[in-house]
């Protein structure tokens, strides 16, 4: 396993609809054709997998149908979007990139993007 540098923004604020987008950039040492991207969430020293996708360079990322993540790739960069976030989902979201093929296998883990989620205030009752 060889190490690889991964960069991601430090902080992102989710939208009022619970959507957060961030970029994950990796230094590809060679011409990888198959890349796996995993988003991990770290909160209270617990790490859980949020979503993962494997894609062929030049193609779209394909997450599972029930995934809360979507994404696109461009060169050595992945644009990730996480939906359905609530205040309790605030935490550090870590981008993990693996160059699966061709060998050698490379692994890179970013420092994480702190995503802040604020639940919207409920609308007051109205007579209108």
């Amino acid at each position: 396993c060889k190490a690889m540098h991964v960069a991601q923004p430090a902080v992102v604020l989710a939208s009022s609809r619970g959507i957060a987008s961030f970029v994950c950039e990796y230094a590809s040492p060679g011409k990888a054709t198959e890349v796996r991207v995993t988003v991990l969430r770290q909160a209270d020293s617990q790490v859980t997998e949020v979503c993962a996708a494997t894609y062929m360079m030049g193609n779209e990322l394909t997450f599972l149908d029930d995934s809360i993540c979507t994404g696109t790739s461009s060169g050595n960069q992945v644009n990730l979007t996480i939906q359905g976030l609530r205040a309790m989902d605030t935490g550090l979201y870590i981008c993990k990139v693996e160059l699966m093929y061709p060998p050698p296998y490379y692994l890179g883990i970013g420092n994480g993007t702190q995503i802040y989620v604020i639940d919207p205030e409920p609308c007051p009752d109205s007579d209108f």
Partner: nanobody
Framework: EVQLVESGGGLVQPGGSLRLSCAAS????????MGWFRQAPGKEREFVAA????????YYADSVKGRFTISRDNAKNTLYLQMNSLRAEDTAVYYC????????????????????WGQGTLVTVSS
């Protein structure tokens, strides 16, 4: 509005080294690709090197590959260009430039993709 201020230029003998710095004001420095360009007397401004927003990927003109190293310190909002084995043909005014879109993946050497420029710092290589 972000300001870019270059420093570190000067007179150096052939074979010598210099380190240029570009200090950026504002809090969005880490979101943008950055580049170094140069303009020699009587010539067009040309691409020297570029670095991605996260500092992960770097790009060089063939003429400086193996001699120049671009780097950045996002915590200090500063871009660097380490120049070794300098030659007379490296004499020029060196400009730093900020990419036009945050978190871009364009990785371009084209001047049109850079939105902001510093005033430049003069590097003279002569014995």
């Amino acid at each position: 509005e972000v300001q870019l201020v270059e420093s570190g230029g000067g007179l150096v003998q052939p074979g010598g080294s210099l380190r240029l710095s570009c200090a950026a004001s504002g809090r969005t420095f880490s979101s943008y690709d950055m580049g170094w360009f140069r303009q020699a007397p009587g010539k067009e401004r040309e691409f020297v090197a570029a670095i991605s927003w996260g500092g992960v990927n770097t790009y060089y003109a063939d003429s400086v590959k193996g001699r120049f190293t671009i780097s950045r310190d996002n915590a200090k909002n500063t871009l660097y260009l380490q120049m070794n084995s300098l030659r007379a043909e490296d004499t020029a005014v060196y400009y730093c430039a900020r990419g036009s879109a945050p978190y871009s993946s364009s990785r371009s050497s084209a001047q049109e993709t850079y939105a902001q420029w510093g005033q430049g710092t003069l590097v003279t290589v002569s014995s």
